[in-house]
């Protein structure tokens, strides 16, 4: 806490400039008005303040705003935002994408802080869904972020927004996620062609039930062993050797390789030997 | 064994409509996709209709789209096959059969319409 | 649609004969060709899948082969029980599609 002292004659600052960054933390308390700082908050990024003397400033600004900063303030507080603390951020209503992402580039190329997940928090909180503007920005930044959000959470994603979704962004999601994500998937590129769909999908389909992957052994998908491992074994297991045949196509060599592995260990357990047989992998069951 | 049983074919007058169905058995229905796969009086077969195990997914040829409706229900082993706007050229056996990934591995007897004024 | 084209559409043989049957695809279906056997009245059994893949309870006397466009059926020594209606199916692309069938009667 910066003790109140008055300010030394000449040193009331008329603007937020250069000059303060020789200023004592005392006397930034003492001669910088905060409502000047508040209208002027764009020009602190661009002087070199000292974190002590950004703890003044933050101070300052904490007082004139006790239940939260106004919006034109918090857009533009570049690093002060690194001084917040999650408690600070939770007074705050963040409805613009603008503001969202000004304060996430303070951010970027570090691990998501816990201010950053109360902010995101409270932005999508405010918004009422996760909408495809939102996911674009956050994903962007945060190739995990929509991993690390309960299927409860999840259930708020609108499919539309689901286009904005890359592969990369669900690298981290656990099948409970994509149980939740994959309907949504499906019915954000239920209008594809078949290729294109499979595109699409692909990355969700660790949510996809039996029924979808029969359905997709009909479209010569031809599926990568990759992704046929990131199944779910319970969505595996009723499958035929006919229907893994034509949904895997010239991929189902592949088996042999994975065999000690699940889902397709427990799969092989599943089949008749002699419908096994029928694949000339040598796969015993 | 699997056994798969056609029943509900007849005369019908063009512009009619018969809904046919397929009592099944021996195998576990609900695991299975299951076709319509008719055969018209000294000709050839005609694949008509798909549905997967579910019912959620249902495949037509453009011979039939919009006329036929293929459906299911799991809980009484039965696959229908419901008929409208039916032509002469429609006149032939169906057959039920069971689809295994590219297969129709298992088929019924058959069963005739015969669309005719 | 893929057409599917067999030859020859009938055929005379006697019991001992070998049989060949050939099917061809219109463009490529890689190896999801099967054959289907069909008696008078009855309906049609499944005899080979995935070109050359015997069904459950198939005699040995039946092979296939072929990939691509071009397939073969074979009968090594036809049967009295083998006179009957063959045909093939593609399975590689909705829709599915039979040939026109191929007729194995007695000499």
């Known amino acids: 806490e910066v003790e109140k002292t008055a300010c030394p004659s000449g040193k009331k600052a008329r603007e937020i400039d250069e000059s303060l960054i020789f200023y004592k933390k005392w006397e930034l308390e003492a001669c910088v008005d905060a409502a000047l700082l508040a209208t002027q908050m764009d020009r602190v990024n661009a002087i070199p303040f000292t974190y002590e003397q950004l703890d003044v400033l933050k101070h300052k600004l904490d007082e004139l705003y006790p239940q939260g900063y106004p919006e034109s303030v918090i857009q533009h507080l570049g690093y002060l935002f690194l001084k917040m603390s999650p408690e600070d951020i939770r007074k705050w209503n963040v409805t613009s994408l603008e503001t969202l992402k000004a304060l996430l580039e303070v951010n970027k190329g570090h691990e998501m802080s816990p201010q950053v997940a109360t902010l995101i928090d409270r932005f999508v909180k405010g918004r009422g869904q996760l909408d495809k503007d939102t996911l674009d920005t956050l994903t962007a930044f945060y190739p995990g972020y929509l991993c690390s959000l309960s299927p409860e959470e999840l259930s708020s994603v609108p499919p539309s927004s689901i286009w904005a979704v890359r592969p990369q962004d669900l690298d981290t999601c656990d099948p409970r996620q994509l149980d939740v994500l994959y309907p949504k998937a499906r019915l954000a590129f239920q209008n594809m062609n078949g290729s294109e769909y499979f595109v699409k999908i692909q990355s969700f389909l660790g949510g996809a039930p039996t029924e979808d992957l029969k359905a997709l052994s009909q479209q010569n998908v031809s599926m990568d062993l990759a992704t046929f491992m990131k199944l779910r074994t319970d969505a595996v297991l009723p499958l035929t050797v006919a229907e893994v045949q034509k949904l895997l196509g010239p991929h189902v060599e592949g088996l042999k390789a994975e065999e000690r592995h699940r889902p397709v260990r427990d799969w092989i357990l599943r089949q008749r030997q002699d419908d096994l047989d029928t694949l000339g992998l040598g796969l015993q069951g | 064994e699997v056994q798969l049983v056609e029943s509900g074919g007849g005369l019908v007058q063009p512009g009619g409509s018969l809904r046919l169905s397929c009592a099944a058995s021996g195998f576990t229905f609900s695991d299975y996709f299951m076709s319509w796969v008719r055969q018209a009086p000294g000709k050839g077969l005609e694949w008509v209709a798909t549905i997967s195990n579910g019912g959620t997914y249902t495949y037509y040829p453009d011979s039939v789209k919009g006329r036929f409706t293929i459906s299911r229900d799991n809980s009484k082993n039965t696959l229908y096959l419901q008929m409208n706007s039916l032509r002469a050229e429609d006149t032939a056996v169906y057959y039920c059969?069971?689809?295994?990934?590219?297969?129709?591995?298992?088929w019924g007897q058959g069963t005739l319409v015969t669309v005719s004024s | 649609d893929i057409q599917m084209t067999q030859s020859p559409s009938s055929l005379s043989a006697s019991v001992g004969d070998r049989v060949t049957i050939t099917c061809r695809a219109s463009?490529?279906?890689?190896?999801?060709l099967n054959w289907y056997q069909q008696k008078p009245g009855k309906a049609p059994k499944l005899l080979i899948y995935?070109?050359?893949r015997l069904h459950s309870g198939v005699p040995s006397r039946f092979s296939g082969s072929g990939s691509g466009t071009d397939f073969t059926l074979t009968i090594s020594s036809l049967q009295p029980e083998d006179f009957a209606t063959y045909y093939c199916?593609?399975?590689?692309?909705?829709?599915?599609?039979f040939g026109q069938g191929t007729k194995v009667e007695i000499k």
């Open positions: 463009q490529d279906i890689s190896s999801y």
């Open positions: 199916q593609q399975g590689n692309t909705l829709p599915y599609t």
């Open positions: 995935y070109t050359s």
């Open positions: 059969a069971r689809f295994d990934g590219y297969i129709f591995d298992y």
